[in-house]
Each structure stands twice: as C-alpha cells, then as structure tokens.
C-alpha cells in the first residue's frame, strides 16, 4: 500500500499557502483528486509530489494515492481544507443525475472542518427542504441524500455559520430520473420462415416483465389468433409463450406475423414474414458485373448470393478455362450466412496470373435442382512494345508491334540526336496512328496491334520512337539508324510481365 | 420582465393536429423547467406535461400520453407542445408555465392560447 | 392517481371577512402542496407553495398550513381584489393533479 507524506488523515491550511504531498509506493504511483488549478506534479519512480505554492479553496478535496501495478489495488488519501474565511463551500459539481431510490451526493466540500457543526442544506430562494427529506453530512464529501425522490429533483445549496451568518454555496442541481420500466421485452421466433405446402411450421412470440400484469398475443395480418398461452416465472421476469404450431402449411398460413405485448406503460411489438411456396427453389445473383476486368498483379472477390429452400445439399467454384485446367483453391473459396434463407459466396483471387484470366462458375444444388452463375474475367496489361525496320513494297518502313490489354493507341515521335526516349524538347514530328491494324485479338488475350511508318530515308543523327498506351500504362521502343544499318533500344525501365 | 407568449391555438378538426408554442423572455429559459397546462371551458386546471430544463426527462398525463409531445429549443427560448389524433375533450386555453427552482411550482405562466376541436 | 378534493367549491363572503378553503388528498402527500389564484381571464398565479411558504410578493393576509393529507388555505381579511378561483395542486409525485377550484366571491 502506497504511503503519504505527510503522515496525517487530514490537513488544514490557509490560502496561499505551501502544499506538497509526497507518495510513496513499492512500483509506480499515481495521484487522483478533485480537478483544481495550481497544482504541480513530480514524478520520480517509485514517489510522485504534488505540490501547490499559492493554495485557495478550490483545492480542497480527498487526494488518493494509488499504485497501478498493485494487484490488491491499496490505496492511500489525505483530506485538504484550505479555509478560506470568504469561502466555506468549494462545489465539484453543479448537476448530480441519479435514478430514484439511489443516494444523491451533492459534491459541496468545506473548506474549514471547524465551520461542520453550523452546516445545513437548503433549495434555493431560501427555501426549507422538503420534509420527508432524508439526508446526512461529511465533510469530505458534501451532502447525501438517501433514496433520493423524483419530487426531490431541485436546486440546492450548502449553508454554513459563519460568524452568526449563513453563507451559501452556488447551487446544485439534482436530476433524479424516474425508473419506469418500459412495455414487455419481446421475441419472435424465427425472423422469417419459408416452407413448402405441406410441410409443418411453427412460429414462438414470447413476452417477460418484471411485472405479471401485461398482455401478449400473436396476429396474422392484422388478424389476432387465438393462442393457448403458457405462463411461467424465471429470473426475477413473468413470461407468456404462444406457439402456433402448423402441421400442413397452405398459402393462406403465408404472410406477416405479429408479436404484440403491452402493459400500463405502452406496447412493443415485432414482427416476422412467413412465406409458402409451391416447391423447392434455388436462385443465383450477384451484385457484381458477370464480365470482369482486372489489371494483372491484382485481386479479385468474385460474389454470389444464394436465395435457397431447402437448404444447400452442395456447391462450388470451376474454372472453366481457356488457359489450364487448374481449378480454384477451396481455401479461398468463402460462405457467409446472411440469414436462414440467403448466403453469400466469394471465392477470392489474388495476385491475378495471365493463366488466371477466363470464366469462373459457382455451382450450388438444393431438392430444387441446380444452379450456376458464370464470371468472365479479363485481365489488363500495359502495352509491350517492339520495332523493327523492315521494306514493304520497296518502300523502308518501321514496323512497330504493341501488345497489351485494352487495346493499346500507338503514337509515333521522330526527335534530334540519340535517345532512349524523345523528350518534349528534341520532338520535331509526332504520328498519332488512330486505326493500328489488329493482329490477334482472342478472348481473355492481350490484343496486339501493328503500326507501320513509312520513311523514305532515315536521318541519321535523329531516333525514331514508338509509343503505346492503354488504361493501365504505357511502353515505347525507340529506334536509332546508324550508318552501319539500324539499331533498335527498348525503353530503359524493365516492363514487369508477369 | 419575465414572459411567456403562447401562440398557435385555433380551430381544428378531430383527428388532426396542431403545434403550440411558448415564446420566453426576460429570463434564463434552459435554466427553468417547463410545463403545459389546459383549462377546458367552465372547467378547472388539469396538468398536461413537463420537461426539464434541459429537454433530457418528459412526462406527461395520461390522458395526452401517445398523442402529445412536449419539446424545446433553448437556443431560440421556446416551448412548443405537438398535439396529434385532438379530440373533442381537447378542447381547452392551454398555458405554459415555468418552474424554477424545482419541477413542481409553477411560478410564472403565458396569458394561454385557445383550442378548439371541432367538426 | 392521488384524488384531491377542495372544498367549498364555492363561496361567498364580505370584504373584511376571514376566508378557509380546505384540500383533501387521498392519500399522504406530506407537504406538497400549493396553492394558486386564479382571476377571471387570467393565467393562475401561485401563492403559497410547499402547503405553507408564501411566494415572494404576495401580500400576508393569504397563508396555508397542514400536512398528510389535510390542507388549509386562509385569507386572514378578504379585500375586493381577492374575486377569483383558488386552486391546489398536489406534487408529491406524477401526474401533477389539481383540486377542483373554489370560486370566491364577495357578497
């Protein structure tokens, strides 16, 4: 247990005096009190100061010491009264809420332990206590008052003799809070039902209170049913039970159920839709779109909601090409429950692979039959670009191959000097080729296109650069004739391919 | 001084509603607590509802219970009473009133603003 | 609901005259309890609050007393500005309830 210094339950000073409180512990300590100005506060190991050189009347208060580390939780408090002669009361708080039936502390602490014997406490505007008003003193603490009243909700203050005259706190206001207990808790059993004609049901509304006067019946569109009900008392709590049992469900058992309880206080009510249909069914949906696009390198959570009754006898992901027959890892493959009725699966794809790309079906199966729901998924890539020098039709010709997905645009640049890449600054010609000739172009493949520029003689000192670009980057090669022929530089950066 | 001006009481269908309100002035108005009195005609007072002075406990008579509702906006110093479903027997002056150093006294009350359900 | 029950519920006297008016409450209510006036086409106005403390301003001839659950109101010496209806209110706890009303008159 932590010890103070210095060693007394209580000490008295003036205003403006020197307080330090020191605190002592086998580990850590830490200081609580009441939020007052001026203090200061040292930490040093096992001892913590707290220490004021200028007190006034609002530092009066309990101040305990506490080791954090101390598993008995010990703790050690010194009461602080600064008697302030113009100041008996220092107020720690001016609204006190409590519910009836609880003690209210009303938080006026005297600054002077002497002044004790002359207090009282009085509502504001003078006025006397209400009789019937049970209430005690410390004054440590302030004033109590013992199972406190809805009618007791007031201003107050604390009185105290001072030299023949009643001084008088700032007031505090007691909120004391009705405990009304509120209509009948509820429950309704399932949320929502779905059976087959022919096929049994049964639906649970159930009510409790504290109190056995209160009301509980089950209603079917608006319609109340009548219900043997069962009654029993557990845990302090009245309970009423209806259960309707239905041994062959129709369509007319369909609709909206009611749970409706009441009391003196108001009523609750849930409800509940039953629906009957004619056989199993089985539906697949998903909010996403079934055609995918999905840049290289990344992921992908493929979702599909699952609306069955009967419940699922099976289901699962197939990949069903074109690249391998590799088939989805089960450990990525997730169900989640929405409610009795609808699930959601995921099958996620991480880090795609070109040999990822194709359709992925979900297949599920209930008495209903089967079902599947198919995704295609087509993977991005920036474009992959290469040129060659080539004749065509006697003419010199640069050939420049771009290969990506989606369809990469190809844009010619002749710029000054040798470079790996033309900069704005050296650009003396630029080509946009709007309609590049498509060379394969296969489902789930990157697209590759060709783009021809004729030049009748090749400068030199110039270079001659292919760009490419898509929604996902972009690639060039630039070209560079030199006397002894021609000399071709892919860009600098490594394109990633994965 | 102090003040209360209830104002929005007319003529008004059964099964209608109506919202009265209490405009406060000359005194702290998120310090009171707030009441709503009616006096049908001929007839003495009967105690509608009360809200504490920072709108956080209502309650109201049994008779209105479901059907009014008291509210405030200290920021504008009003009162307001929302009465849904009238009645006939709603018909009445309604007063507010405040209360200030308990919920009880009714110290300082409106000239009141008349109801009238009728069809 | 605690019922309270005024008595007269009318009443005629003379100027000078020292008026009782009584409130009867069902139940104990200790005391509180207070006591309102009011004037034709007026807003009540109260005047003794917790069954015996009289509201700063209002002149000393009125005055209550009583607790439990039997309560007096007095005017000591009825003057012609004191025409009206005086009610009770109980607030022991809620809903707050009022006492019929005595209607005051000079004869």
């Known amino acids: 247990i932590p010890v103070i210094e210095p060693s007394v339950p209580e000490l008295v000073v003036k205003p403006g005096a020197t307080v330090t409180l020191r605190c002592v512990g086998n580990g850590s300590v830490e200081w609580d009190g009441p939020p007052s100005p001026h203090w200061t506060l040292y930490s040093d190991g096992s001892s913590s100061i707290l220490s004021t050189n200028n007190a006034t009347f609002q530092n009066t208060g309990t101040y305990r010491c506490t080791e954090p580390g101390d598993p008995l939780g010990g703790s050690a408090a010194i009461h602080l009264y600064v008697k302030d002669p113009a100041r008996p009361w220092n107020v720690l708080a001016q609204e006190v809420v409590v519910f009836e039936d609880q003690d209210a502390l009303l938080p006026c602490l005297l600054t002077d332990p002497v002044l004790e014997a002359g207090v009282s406490l009085v509502r504001v505007r003078g006025r006397p206590l209400m009789r019937h008003t049970n209430y005690s003193f410390s004054p440590w603490h302030g004033f109590t008052i013992h199972r406190a009243k809805f009618i007791q909700s007031q201003d107050y203050q604390c009185s105290a003799l001072m030299g023949g005259r009643k001084v008088m706190s700032i007031s505090i206001r007691l909120k004391v809070q009705k405990v009304i207990p509120g209509p009948p808790a509820l429950t309704l059993v399932p949320a929502e039902l779905v059976r087959i004609r022919g096929e049994a049901a049964q639906i649970v509304c159930s009510a409790s209170s504290v109190d056995v006067n209160f009301d509980v019946f089950l209603q079917h569109n608006n319609t109340k049913l009548a219900i043997p009900q069962q009654s029993d008392f557990h845990n302090n709590r009245y309970q009423k039970v209806l259960t309707l049992n239905l041994d062959q469900v129709d369509f007319q058992h369909a609709g909206n159920y009611s749970c409706v309880a009441s009391n003196v206080q108001g009523k609750h009510s849930t409800s509940m839709f039953f629906r009957v249909v004619e056989s199993a069914y089985l539906n697949l949906s998903s909010e996403q779109n079934l055609i995918q696009e999905v840049t290289v390198g990344e992921g992908l959570n493929l979702k599909v909601m699952v609306e069955a009754y009967p419940g699922l006898q099976g289901f699962n992901w197939t990949y069903l090409g074109p690249f391998s027959d590799h088939q989805p890892e089960p450990k990525l493959a997730n169900a989640t429950t929405k409610d009795t009725y609808r699930h959601t699966f995921t099958l996620s794809l991480p880090r795609l692979k070109p040999s990822e790309a194709g359709r992925y079906s979900f297949l599920a199966r209930n008495p209903g039959g089967w079902r599947a729901l198919t995704f295609e998924l087509t993977l991005r890539y920036p474009p992959e670009v290469s040129v060659i020098w080539t004749f065509i039709n006697g003419s010199g010709t640069l050939l420049c191959a771009a290969s990506g997905y989606p369809q990469p645009n190809v844009t010619w640049l002749q710029c000054s000097g040798h470079t790996d890449r033309c900069d704005e600054a050296q650009v003396l010609q630029v080509w946009d080729d709007p309609y590049p000739e498509v060379l394969s172009q296969e489902p789930f493949h990157k697209v590759t296109v060709q783009s021809l520029l004729t030049v009748e003689t090749l400068e030199h000192n110039q270079t001659y650069e292919c760009r490419a670009h898509n929604s996902v980057g972009s690639g060039s090669w630039a070209f560079i004739p030199i006397s002894a022929g021609a000399h071709t530089h892919p860009p600098d950066e490594f394109l990633f391919t994965p | 001084q102090v003040q209360l001006v209830e104002s929005g009481g007319g003529v008004v269908q059964p099964g209608r509603s109506l919202r009265l309100s209490c405009a406060a002035s000359?005194?702290?108005?998120?310090?009171?607590?707030m009441h709503w009195v009616r006096q049908a005609p001929g007839k003495g007072l009967e105690w509608v509802a009360v809200?504490?002075?920072?709108?956080?406990?209502?309650y109201y008579a049994d008779s209105v219970k479901g059907r009014f509702t008291i509210s405030r906006d200290n920021s504008k110093n009003t009162l307001y009473l929302q009465m849904n479903s009238l009645r006939a027997e709603d018909t009445a002056v309604y007063y507010c009133?405040?209360?200030?150093?308990?919920?009880?006294?009714?110290?300082?009350w409106g000239q009141g603003t008349t109801v009238t359900v009728s069809s | 609901d605690i019922q309270m029950t005024q008595s007269p519920s009318s009443l005629s006297a003379s100027v000078g005259d020292r008026v009782t008016i009584t409130c009867q409450a069902s139940?104990?209510?200790?005391?509180?309890l207070n006591w309102y006036q009011q004037k034709p086409g007026k807003a009540p106005k109260l005047l003794i609050y917790?069954?015996?403390n009289l509201e700063t301003g209002v002149p000393s001839r009125f005055s209550g007393s009583g607790s439990g659950t039997d309560f007096t109101f007095t005017i000591s010496s009825l003057q012609p500005e004191d025409i009206a209806t005086y009610y009770c209110?109980?607030?022991?706890?809620?809903?707050?309830?009022f006492g019929q009303g005595t209607r005051l008159e000079i004869k």
């Open positions: 009133a405040s209360s200030s150093s308990n919920f009880y006294d009714m110290d300082v």
């Open positions: 209110q109980r607030y022991d706890d809620l809903p707050i309830t």
């Open positions: 917790d069954a015996s």
């Open positions: 000359g005194f702290t108005f998120s310090s009171y607590g």
């Open positions: 139940q104990d209510i200790s005391n509180y």
């Open positions: 809200i504490w002075y920072d709108g956080s406990n209502k």
